[in-house]
Interface confidence: medium
């Protein structure tokens, strides 16, 4: 922010009324009036260029320092070119000297040169040459100097002429303040600029109404530089919940809007399925039947639990069931839908039912499913199963009701056996198989069917109670198609997949490959 100037002395604004002291009296400096831009202006002028040894002083009135520590002196003046005078005026100068003296009282007309300290020699950037003078072009020079630190009650300035043709049109003395400032929702008080160039006065800011330092943030601070400019802002204030930044203030959220936290963000419109909020709201309450999950942002619409899965099918495949369903028609306004599958089995004979989670196997964990299908295996044959698929979302836990659909299936077959080749020779194949233990008690025998590949006219069948068989009297180096099927009291179980196994060729008869 630009420095604020507090003027202590302004000659140009005084309209010739200040009555400064000239020394020697009646010679040298003289108060004159002129016309510039059709306006009368006053100036202190001296032009004793033809006489040598000039020592003409002009002293200001006593200036009360007040709270100033460093003063700035702005001079506007014109200096005439020494060559514009006939003969060049050999004793003519083109500079003058600026002095100051501090004092605790006004000495009045008692002028003593020895009390004054030189600030600088003031030289013009542009001198007024003959043609400018004739054409009334005033070549105005502006020079600024500063003095500090000042310690006494007041001070004088003095101008020493040593033989120049100079006119002082403006003498302005001021000090600088860092102005009252509102920045980052913090108010910084008007602060007097320090007197030493390297130093920066640290000033604490106070948060405006309804603004606070954010958690973990730094308190607002600024630095007031010598030139009255605020520098190096540190920290900030932010509008508290329910308020937003409007220019340099925090304004309550309008009805129908809310702000949840201390932040830079503006108030947001209440989302869908919320009740209209009052002024200054930090949140918007949900409509009846709608909810907000703990992790939901306040800007998210209120939501409700989903409806049941839209369509559920159970397709039996031996001792397996594939469950498929489609998403709920009403998602409740959320995308975090998951599904849970539960299983119940019933014995047809007794009609007794119970949970079957521990006895069946799911293709993936049955709770928190995101896909819309799952395969259930290790089902017992000749058992009735009921599967329940529940749809849940982030707000389902906030209500007691559940959204589910059920499907029932009867298992009439055992699961197809899993077949392995255990060994082979030129004339035999050793085959084993397995089925899930819960189903084994229902199996009476296993039927092994085999035939040469490519021979569709004849096949052989072997029955056994065990889980393996050796098929011999086979032709060497020949591929056989082998299938295993469980036989139960109720009939045939599901057949295994048809496997191709090859006997060894006579050359390789010395080894038994597993």
């Amino acid at each position: 922010a630009q420095g604020k100037e507090v003027v202590l002395l302004d000659f140009a604004a005084a309209g010739g009324e200040l009555g400064w002291l000239t020394h020697p009296y009646g010679k040298g400096w003289d108060l004159m009036q002129n016309i510039m831009n059709d306006m009368p202006i006053y100036m202190y002028s001296v032009c004793n260029v033809m006489s040598g040894d000039q020592d003409n002083w002009l002293r200001t009135n006593w200036v009360y320092r007040g709270e100033a520590e460093r003063i700035f002196i702005e001079l506007k003046f014109t200096v005439r070119d020494c060559n514009s005078f006939p003969g060049g005026a050999s004793s003519c100068k083109e500079t003058f000297n600026l002095y100051y003296a501090e004092s605790d009282l006004d000495y009045g007309t008692n002028f003593q040169k020895r009390l004054f300290t030189k600030i600088d020699t003031i030289a013009p950037d542009e001198i007024t040459v003959s043609s400018d003078f004739e054409a009334r072009h005033v070549k105005l020079n502006v020079e600024e100097r500063s003095v500090g630190p000042l310690t006494r009650k007041g001070f004088y300035l003095a101008f020493q002429d040593i033989g120049a043709c100079v006119a002082l049109l403006s003498v302005r003395v001021y000090y600088k303040k860092c102005p009252e400032l509102l920045q980052s929702l913090a108010r910084f008080p008007e602060t007097i600029a320090g007197s030493d160039a390297p130093s920066l006065a640290t000033v604490a800011g106070t948060c405006v109404d309804h603004a606070v330092v954010p958690p973990g943030g730094e308190e607002p601070r600024m630095h007031c530089a010598v030139d009255g400019e605020w520098l190096v802002p540190i920290g900030q204030c932010l509008c508290q919940a329910g308020y937003e930044k409007v220019e340099d203030a925090c304004q309550a959220c309008s009805p129908g809007f809310f702000k949840f936290e201390v932040s830079e963000s503006p108030c947001l419109e209440c989302p869908e399925h919320t009740l209209p909020s009052p002024e200054g709201a930090t949140s918007c309450e949900c409509e009846e039947g709608f909810f907000r999950a703990p992790q939901d942002p306040m800007s998210m619409p209120c939501t409700r639990p989903p409806s049941a899965p839209h369509y559920l099918t159970a397709v039996g495949m031996g001792a397996k069931v594939e469950l498929r369903w489609t998403p709920p028609q009403d998602s409740g306004g959320r995308e975090d839908i998951v599904y849970s599958v539960t299983c119940e089995q019933c014995w047809p004979e007794s009609g007794e039912c119970g949970p079957c989670e521990s006895s069946v196997r799911y293709s993936e964990p049955p709770h928190g499913l995101t896909r819309t299908s799952v395969t259930v295996s290790d089902l017992e044959p000749h058992m009735n199963y009921t599967f329940t698929v529940e749809a849940r979302n982030g707000v389902s836990g906030l209500v007691t009701s559940r959204s589910f659909r059920t499907a029932s299936v009867s298992i009439n077959q055992t699961e197809p056996p899993k077949v392995r080749l255990e060994g082979r020779s030129t004339t035999s194949l050793s085959v084993s198989w397995s089925i899930p233990p819960p189903q084994q008690s229902r199996v009476w025998k296993y039927e092994v069917t085999y035939r040469k590949k490519g021979d569709s006219n004849s096949y052989n069948v072997r029955r056994t109670e065990g889980f393996s068989v050796t098929l011999d009297d086979l032709a060497p180096d020949t591929t056989y198609l082998v299938q295993v099927q469980a036989l139960t009291q109720e009939g045939q179980g599901a057949g295994s997949k048809v496997h191709e196994f090859q006997t060894l060729s006579p050359e390789g008869s010395g080894s038994l490959a597993v």
């Epitope: 009036q33 002129n34 014109t78 043609s131 054409a135 043709c165 006119a167």
Partner: antibody, heavy 128, light 107 residues
Amino acid sequence: EVQLLESGGGLVQPGGSLRLSCAASGFTFSHYMMAWVRQAPGKGLEWVSRIGPSGGPTHYADSVKGRFTISRDNSKNTLYLQMNSLRAEDTAVYYCAGYDSGYDYVAVAGPAEYFQHWGQGTLVTVSS
Amino acid sequence: DIQMTQSPSSLSASVGDRVTITCRASQSISTWLAWYQQKPGKAPKLLIYKASNLHTGVPSRFSGSGSGTEFSLTISGLQPDDFATYYCQQYNVYSRTFGQGTKVEIK
């Protein structure tokens, strides 16, 4: 020695025109502001017009504005006054006058000038 | 325009007398004032500029003073050559204006 010599005066009818000249010598003409000042018979002095050292700016008294034109030719060291639409009240001795700021020991010139050097004058009579 | 009023309009004096002519401006002109002397049938001559500065070659018996609106020309020890009409002129604004003149005659 500074010399200013006016010419071109005479008798002219109202509404007529006349051109006055002022030949300068003895000084650097192009450094001087030049002016015309007139004096009606038995009356006081009245400033008429001025022209800057390089030919501008020019200023006129309200009584002659729009009718008189001041000009100069620095190569000929001559000042002119073209007078049109002459009236009886323009009857006067017309003096050419000059001012050199170099002799003015002041830091800022007044907006106008005084006159250091004068010619002997030329009489202009406007009568029917 | 600024009006310049001289007084008296004429005066009679003897050789050796001290004569003062005054000139009043209708508004402040600081020290932007000149004095001229004119003899019958002759061109005016510059005496004083900037209220109190003597023009080159002008006898020291002539002096000027004043600032603002009140000015005066003083001849201390009137000489026979000084009987003439004296005019003041302001040059504070572009329309340079003369006073109506003061005629100094032999008593």
